[in-house]
């Protein structure tokens, strides 16, 4: 059993051009985390398994927002190591596979977004014990520096952590009369004591006193970088004019990489950077399989038909991306019919309809001669695929639910005064005038114009109470006919009220889930 | 091979409760949603809830028919989910599967849980 | 929470013949329709995704086809190890539902 340890350095813009300043999108600030995953690479049997070494998911970063003209640094990283036990013994052989997510912190309904910023996948061999090993690896346009070492947890000891051992201290377990001990048990050592001042960072011993440098490292503590020429790398016949060496046959010629991956030439060799889903020496081994969950959010992992992929991810509504680590805006497509305002929650779009709307894309017009929709005694009228209300006197708007004032129109003849009342309108004639609209003439012998009508009533004539009680009456039976419309109309818009309010409630249930 | 195993189910009372098992090898547990699904007796099947990764905080999801009577936890070290059902009723008795992902594209064999006095 | 409805219930054929399994849903789902499979004292496993993409290993005599509210899953020619209970479920809106079931039996 032991402990494989990894420890990123830094994560950041590549050298050269075209390098992105920010790992962030526009979308505001992000943080970075890493997905470390091992797998024995001793065969293809084992390369095509999950991580069956481990794998381990690093802590958030801080949080890190791109200042504007600032140079790209080398990013903000998560604290501590990156830790993978293993139960088993250590295989030597490994494949190293080291994931860069971004989370982005944006404004965003139903959680942050995470994306694959870059994916390194190496086979190595390390010996359990030994010192930090140092990589540069490119992916894409960034570069990633790390460390990694397996060790051992006592009592295992060894190069595989295979042999067990006690404390030199610890009095011997064999006592008179039994049997040898084990002969797996060792003696434990403790680690050597480096020579004073050697690097922690760049030097490690295996003797008591000795300061062993790693590679790019020299000097007495390893503290000197290693110089580089520029002529590094070619080959062919000397040049006489440059010092340096004329180019021969490069090592990519006829592309040595496989599935798809393209070659860079290195120093007296070359390098495959593989597509996704593979890696080895010549991206020969399948990396990734739909074992490891290589799909974020829930995406079904599918084999890939074609060689150039080791497998596909179906993304669940949402979400999109090679990985399904991008979330999509579903809401920019406007779904919600009417002016219904929409919210992504994630796994569900949902639209709060605006008044007099309703279904989940808020398609249904409520307010249509089949809903009743004419208010305050209006009459619905249809035609053409639309409808319109006529109101009822004193009413007017779309749905009769705007006060009119009846007076605006000047109905009341000959002086009359107009006086605006729930039913309509009342008009107190001038003298010398009657009815509805003070439209008849009275005769000044107390006979109207008309032969049929009553006689006037002239100011103080003590049957205009009478007239007047009726009048009130009348007006009474109006209003208790309106009431009577308004809480038919109030019954039936509650029954769309509480389906609205619950739509609500599931919403806020869904978005605080 | 990719294998879920459930295990837990049994006989309990009405108001009674039971813990569920769920152990996976052949995948990278940590990297997958998990979810529980039950089929009572003779019926279709029916979500019961779901867990999501350490880096989403292990947020988890419930049908309303459960909601604060059951629990679902995961520990990544030991690739097992777990079902924690409290106040159990009689609709409760079902077979009941854990899968993974948003498409329960992996299926256990399923674990009997009886609620009946 | 969206509700599928399946038909028929019971589907009696032929090894050989050709089934038709139909789902319904109460609103649109896009294609976020899978099928299942089930057969007796097993537990359910998955055919086809997305509406019409056969999952890993699925013979291809398993189709299926539709988008919005009506879908179909469809048996080229019935093995005597497709008689089973079939589901229809949709992954559109959270929770994911299942259909009532279909089940295809020998005639």
């Known amino acids: 059993a032991g402990v494989f340890e990894l420890q990123i350095h830094s994560f950041g813009p590549g050298p050269g051009p075209g390098a992105p300043r920010s790992p962030c999108s526009a979308r505001g600030p992000c943080r970075l985390f890493f997905r470390v995953c091992l797998k024995p690479g001793l065969s293809e049997e084992a390369a095509e398994s999950p991580c069956a070494l481990g794998a381990a998911l690093s802590a958030r970063g801080p949080v890190y927002t791109e200042q504007p003209e600032a140079p790209a640094p080398d990013l903000p990283l998560p604290n501590g190591l990156l830790q993978v036990p293993f139960r088993d013994a250590w295989p030597g052989t490994f494949s190293l596979i080291i994931e860069t997510w971004r989370e982005e912190l944006g404004d965003q309904i139903g959680g942050p977004a995470w994306s694959l910023l870059a994916r390194v996948t190496r086979r190595r061999r390390l010996a359990a014990g030994g010192p930090w090993a140092r990589d540069i690896q490119r992916a894409g346009a960034w570069e990633l520096r790390f460390s990694y070492r397996a060790r051992c947890e006592l009592p295992a000891v060894g190069t595989a952590c295979t042999r067990l051992c006690r404390p030199r201290s610890a009095p011997s377990r064999c006592g008179p009369g039994l049997r040898p001990c084990a002969p797996l048990e060792d003696e434990c050592e403790a680690p050597p004591v480096c020579r004073a001042g050697c690097s922690l960072e760049h030097g490690f011993c295996e003797q008591p006193g000795e300061c062993r440098c790693l590679e790019g490292w020299t000097g007495p503590l390893c503290m000197v970088p290693v110089s580089t020429s520029s002529c590094l790398g070619l080959r062919g016949p000397s040049s006489t004019t440059t010092g340096c060496l004329v180019p021969g046959p490069g090592p990519c010629d006829g592309n040595p990489c496989a599935n798809g991956g393209s070659c860079s030439e290195t120093p007296g060799s070359f390098e495959c950077t593989c597509p996704r889903g593979f890696y080895g020496l010549r991206c020969e081994v399948s990396g990734v399989t739909c074992a490891d969950g290589p799909c974020f959010n829930g995406g079904l992992c599918v084999g890939g038909a074609d060689p150039d992929s080791a497998y596909i991810c179906h993304c669940p509504p949402g979400f999109q991306g090679s990985n399904c680590e991008k979330r999509v805006d579903r809401c920019s497509l406007q779904p919600c019919r009417n002016g219904g305002l929409c919210l992504d929650l994630g796994h569900a779009l949902r639209c709060r309809c605006r008044a007099g709307f309703a279904g989940p894309r808020c398609e249904h017009d409520l307010d249509d001669c089949a809903g009743r929709a004419c208010a305050n005694g209006g009459t619905c009228v249809e035609g053409g695929g639309a409808h319109r209300c006529s109101c009822a006197l004193g009413f007017g708007g779309r749905n009769c639910r705007e006060r009119a004032d009846p007076c605006a129109a000047r109905p009341c003849a000959h002086g009359g005064r107009c006086y605006a009342h729930f039913s309509g309108l009342v008009c107190a004639c001038a003298p010398g005038y009657m009815g509805a609209r003070c439209e008849f003439p009275v005769h000044p012998d107390g006979v109207s114009a008309l032969p049929a009508a009553p006689p006037g009533l002239r100011p103080g004539d003590p049957q205009r109470a009478g007239v007047i009680a009726v009048i009130v009456v009348v007006v009474i039976a109006i209003v208790a006919g309106i009431v009577v419309l308004v809480i038919s109309r109030k019954k039936r818009m509650a029954k769309y009220e509480k389906a609205e309010i619950k739509e609500m409630g599931e919403m806020h249930r869904e978005l605080n889930a | 091979e990719v294998q879920l195993v459930e295990s837990g189910g049994g006989l309990v009372k009405p108001g009674g409760s039971l813990r569920l098992s769920c152990a996976a090898s052949g995948i990278t547990f940590s990297n997958f949603w998990m979810n529980w699904v039950r089929q009572a007796p003779g019926k279709g099947l029916e979500w019961v809830g779901q867990i999501r990764l350490k880096s989403e905080d292990y947020a988890t999801h419930y049908a309303e028919s459960v909601k604060g009577r059951f629990t679902i936890s995961r520990e990544d070290s030991k690739n097992t989910v777990y079902l924690q059902m409290n106040s159990l009723k009689t609709e409760d008795t079902a077979v009941y599967y854990c899968?993974?992902?948003?498409?329960?594209?992996?299926w256990g064999q399923g674990t009997t849980v009886t609620v009946s006095s | 929470n969206i509700v599928l409805t399946q038909s028929p219930a019971t589907l009696s054929l032929s090894p050989g013949e050709r089934a038709t399994l139909s789902c319904k849903a109460s609103e649109n789902v896009g294609t976020y329709v899978s099928w299942f499979q089930q057969k007796p004292g097993q537990s359910p496993r998955l055919l086809i995704y997305g509406a019409s993409n056969r999952y890993t290993g699925i013979p291809a005599r398993f189709s299926g086809s539709g988008s919005g509210t009506d879908f179909t899953l469809t048996i080229s020619s019935l093995e005597p190890e497709d008689f089973a209970v079939y589901y229809c479920?949709?992954?559109?809106?959270?929770?994911?539902?299942f259909g009532g079931g279909t089940k295809v039996e020998i005639k």
């Open positions: 899968t993974t992902g948003y498409y329960f594209d992996y």
């Open positions: 479920g949709q992954f559109y809106s959270f929770p994911s539902t």
